[in-house]
């Protein structure tokens, strides 16, 4: 560290030689001692501070701030300025040393630039060829070639200075390819190195200001703008900065040439504008112009100066975003602020991280919107300096075109008993809910079948014309249709029912649901038979390994020869277009089934039983009955669907919650399985039982804790079990706030 002597004003270092110029002979030893009042350093010619082995700098033994510089066996190239200076100030003492060597009167300078001198055509500009002398009193002339020309100092425009070199107006040597200095000593001629003359070019390729897209600062901060110009080789440039406030100091402009790769075909120049402490007046466009004489190029950037750091949302920030399922969603954050804010996105209170489907940042991007993306998204802007925060909520609604639940579940070939009253159902899920659900009908024979594979289990028919159900002339009398809302599988659905008073004619019914994003429809084949009737026992859809039986009953006064068959795979259509209408024609290969006959007062009942129902038992079952009088065969078809056994799975995770004392916690345990699981709740691994504050609903699926107390805090576990195993979901409920003592307590 620098140590100064207290109470003493600082004086320049003193050298052991009192002269400004010192002349010594080559091969002798140069030794200069420097004394001062604080830490010292030496600099010697060619700017090599402490890097040359021949130069020795030693501490003096008798003085605290003293250093001696020694060079043994000096050579002509050691000629130059020797400078002793204080490390931390500009204060210095200099002696210029000539090392006289009449065999080499010229010394090489580091500014020689490998023997190249760049000149311009400026008549007034003086060029310096850096042939420095190891002696001050030489008679030096400048030789230029080709053609050969000699220039001698004239006491005016042409001169030689041992410390600088040969000065000459540039236009005098602009014709030359090379120049060198020459000195005559005792009739001997000595030459300096050869300097190649390069005439300056002028083409500017481009000028770039950085930062290019503008700068934002607050009052008092430092502004630094860089202007880079790329030019052809040998170009000289003038830089100029334009801005109203630049007329008034303080501003600092530093221009310099940048190093380029060896062999590069261009030069680079840099102009740096610095304003140490900006004011509002410094706001605006800054233009940098680079000028070479025969070319000017300019570029600009905008500087915005804010009164202080701030953050805010810009106008046009969306609050509600609606999109259809599958759409790409982009929600840009429109912000104002300095410096740029940190941006964080939360969904329903949870921090969002980018993944393969969602990207967060200046734009919230959801690559393919799904229903689960619906929710409230909060974007929080934080000023990195002041930590000021601003938040904005964006409600995202992912709209779903109407989906009709039964579409894939109900077989298109079920039959309905003549004269029976029937209820047809369409369960519609749509976001937003459907603005209408309408029912239409048409006689079976008026419709043809579609020949498209995709329609196999959905809409196998096309009808040229659909009639409104209110117009039931020639069809089945309709009692009416009604729409109800129901919470099914945790979703709000619309259940539309059509009541048919009496099944008299075979027809097709269509329900059509429409909402703002699309439409959905379901076609129901309503095939009426006067023949037997099929029922399933038990009536619920069977699961694997359960016992199920199909009953076929027919009036024994009308029918005989009841038979159960299973439709072979070839009898089922490969294409929907092959679906038979009416159902009982062309049934193809049938597999007859074992069955048991029962009778009651009016009917014969034929029962086929599946002891241990398997997925292989699924299919279309046909019951035949023969008319006693006409011997005509009648049939009815029933599709048997066997549900696959599935161990319970959690379909919606429980989420940790933080609640305040006295509030209500409501959670649902979403699990599916076949057979359906039974639900049990635990708190801190102890089974929960209902009491005044704890309510279990929907078969223990929903847990409600009313008037939350501090002791309700803990780990809650929902367990869903069936014969196939158990699954668990856990969540930790934190209860905040102090417990108030009640009068009761």
């Amino acid at each position: 560290a620098s140590v100064g002597l207290p109470g003493v004003s600082l004086e320049s270092p003193t050298l052991s030689t009192q002269k400004d110029i010192l002349t010594i002979m080559a091969n002798s030893t140069l030794q200069i001692t420097c004394r001062g009042q604080r830490e010292l350093d030496w600099l010697w010619p060619n700017h090599q501070s402490g890097s040359e082995e021949r130069v020795e700098v030693t501490e003096c033994s008798d003085d605290l701030f003293c250093k001696t510089l020694t060079i043994a066996k000096v050579i002509a190239n050691d000629t130059g300025a020797y400078k002793c200076f204080y490390q931390d100030t500009n204060m210095a003492s200099v002696v210029y040393v000539y090392v006289q060597d009449y065999r080499s009167p010229f010394i090489a300078s580091v500014s020689d630039q490998h023997g190249v001198v760049f000149i311009t055509e400026n008549k007034n500009k003086t060029m310096v060829i850096p042939c420095l002398g190891s002696t001050s009193n030489l008679n030096v002339s400048l030789c230029a070639r080709y053609p050969e020309k000699r220039f001698v100092p004239d006491g005016d425009k042409i001169s030689w200075d041992s410390k600088k070199g040969f000065s000459i107006p540039s236009y005098m040597i602009s014709y030359a390819g090379m120049v060198f200095c020459e000195a005559k000593i005792h009739d001997e001629t000595y030459q300096s190195i050869m300097y190649i003359v390069v005439v300056v070019g002028y083409r500017i390729y481009d000028v770039l200001v950085s930062p290019p897209h503008g700068v934002e600062l607050s009052v008092g901060q430092k502004l630094v703008l860089n202007c880079t110009a790329r030019t052809e080789l040998n170009v000289g440039l003038d830089f100029n900065w334009e801005h109203p406030s630049l007329k008034h100091p303080p501003k600092k402009v530093v221009n310099r040439e940048l190093k380029t790769q060896p062999g590069s075909e261009m030069k680079k120049f840099l102009s740096t504008l610095t304003i140490e402490s900006v004011t509002r007046a410094d706001q605006g466009w800054y233009i940098c112009a680079a000028s070479s004489g025969l070319m000017t190029k300019r570029n600009s950037t905008f500087v915005r100066v804010h009164e202080k750091p701030f953050v805010a949302f810009g106008s046009g920030m969306e609050s509600l975003v609606e999109a259809a399922v599958g759409a790409r969603i982009r929600v840009p954050v429109r912000w104002l602020g300095y410096p740029p804010p940190e941006i964080k996105w939360y969904k329903n209170g949870r921090l969002l991280e980018s993944n393969h489907t969602i990207k967060v940042g200046h734009v919230l991007t959801i690559s393919e919107a799904s229903e689960k993306d619906t929710g409230n998204y909060t974007v929080i802007l934080t000023n990195p300096i002041t930590r000021e925060k601003q938040s904005h909520v964006v409600s995202l609604v992912v709209n779903v075109p109407p989906q009709i639940g039964e579409k894939s579940l109900i077989s298109p070939v079920d039959s309905y008993q003549y004269g029976s009253s029937q209820t047809l159902t369409c369960t519609v899920y749509a976001v937003p809910p459907p603005h209408h659900i309408r029912w239409y009908w048409q006689l079976e024979e008026e419709c043809s079948e579609q020949a498209s594979q995709s329609a196999l289990m959905t809409n196998p028919y096309t009808c040229k014309e659909w009639r409104n159900v209110e117009d039931f002339q020639g069809g089945n009398r309709i009692e009416g249709s009604k729409n109800q809302f129901a919470l099914i599988e945790g979703k709000n659905k619309t259940v539309s029912t059509l009541v048919i008073q009496a099944a008299n004619v075979s027809a097709l019914y269509k329900c059509e649901a429409v909402n703002s994003v699309g439409r959905g429809e379901r076609i129901i084949s309503f095939h009426v038979t006067r023949g037997p009737e099929i029922t399933l026992h038990p009536s619920t859809q069977p699961t694997e390994q359960e016992t199920v039986s199909l009953w076929c009953s027919a009036d024994r006064t009308t029918f005989e020869n009841l038979t159960w068959c299973k439709l072979g795979p070839q009898a089922l259509p490969v294409h929907a277009g092959e679906l038979p209408v009416p159902v009982c024609e062309n049934l193809g290969a049938l597999a007859r089934l074992n069955a048991t006959v029962f009778s009651n007062s009016t009917n014969d009942i034929l029962i086929t039983e599946f002891q241990n129902a398997s997925l292989q038992d699924q299919g279309h079952y046909v019951c035949f009955a023969q008319d006693k009088k006409t011997k005509k065969r009648h049939c009815v078809v029933r599709q048997l669907v066997v549900l696959e056994r599935m161990a319970p799975v959690i379909t919606g995770s429980l989420e940790n919650q933080t609640t305040s004392i006295g509030e209500t916690i409501e959670v649902s345990c979403m699990a599916s399985g076949n057979p359906p699981p039974q639900f049990t709740w635990f708190k801190d691994n102890e089974m929960l039982v209902e009491d005044s504050g704890i309510i279990l609903k929907a078969g223990n699926q929903n847990l409600t804790i009313r008037r939350v107390r501090k002791e309700d805090e803990g780990l809650y576990t929902c367990q869903a079990c069936s014969v196939l195993g158990c699954v668990r979901a856990e969540a930790f409920f934190i209860v905040e706030g102090a417990q108030e003592k009640t009068n009761l307590e």
Partner: antibody, heavy 116, light 107 residues
Framework: EVQLVQSGGGLVKPGGSLRLSCAAS????????MLWVRQAPGKGLEWVSA????????YYADSVKGRFTISRDNAKNSLYLQMNSLRAEDTAVYYC?????????WGQGTLVTVSS | DIQMTQSPSSVSASVGDRVTITCRAS??????LTWYQQKPGKAPKLLIY???SLQSGVPSRFSGSGSGTDFTLTISSLQPEDFATYYC?????????FGGGTKVDIK
């Protein structure tokens, strides 16, 4: 409006001198290189001299080197051409022009006639 | 110095004609070529720089092409105000040099 207005032309005897001026307005004069181009009667265009924005770099055509001097005063938004030792072949309309990627803005021209 | 040669030295054309003027450099100048238009008694006006870049405010019927030594100025549909003398100029090497000019007059 960006414009260059010239003055100073006229009739001069061989060996005489003349100083041409070019006043700039409508742009930041101090940022641009400027130049002079001349056109002898019925002939084509010939570049004469150029100067960089801060006068650091000056160029002359060989035909005028040593006789003509280009200069500028950025404070006055003015460009000058001092013509000495004039010859008959210097007779021409002299134009000043602003330099960007090319010579984009030109003065209206001023006629210099060198004749005895 | 680089010599610039224009051809033809004059061309007679009618309104609506397509006119092409060529300019050849004595050595390669990449795309450092400029075109000017000059009307009698007026100062030259910059049309095209860097061989093909149209100067702001110049009608799009003017276009430039070429690189190296051979360059072309094309007026796609000659208008009455286009009758003038056209000069090319190289900006590749010092000193800048102009072509001898091509006069476009009314047929």
């Amino acid at each position: 409006e960006v414009q260059l207005v010239q003055s100073g032309g006229g009739l001069v005897k061989p060996g005489g001198s003349l100083r041409l001026s070019c006043a700039a307005s409508g742009f930041t004069f101090s940022s641009y290189s400027m130049l002079w181009v001349r056109q002898a009667p019925g002939k084509g265009l010939e570049w004469v001299s150029a100067i960089s924005s801060s006068s650091s770099y000056i160029y002359y055509a060989d035909s005028v080197k040593g006789r003509f001097t280009i200069s500028r005063d950025n404070a006055k938004n003015s460009l000058y051409l001092q013509m000495n030792s004039l010859r008959a072949e210097d007779t021409a309309v002299y134009y000043c022009a602003r330099v960007t990627d090319a010579f984009d803005i030109w003065g209206q021209g001023t006629l210099v006639t060198v004749s005895s | 110095d680089i010599q610039m040669t224009q051809s033809p030295s004059s061309v007679s054309a009618s309104v609506g004609d397509r006119v092409t003027i060529t300019c050849r450099a004595s050595r390669g100048i990449d795309n450092w070529l400029t075109w000017y238009q000059q009307k009698p008694g007026k100062a030259p006006k910059l049309l095209i720089y860097e061989a093909s870049s149209l100067q702001s405010g110049v009608p799009s019927r003017f276009s430039g092409s070429g690189s190296g030594t051979d360059f072309t100025l094309t007026i796609s549909s000659l208008q009455p105000e286009d009758f003038a003398t056209y000069y090319c100029q190289q900006a590749k090497a010092f000193p800048p040099t102009f072509g001898g000019g091509t006069k476009v007059d009314i047929k």
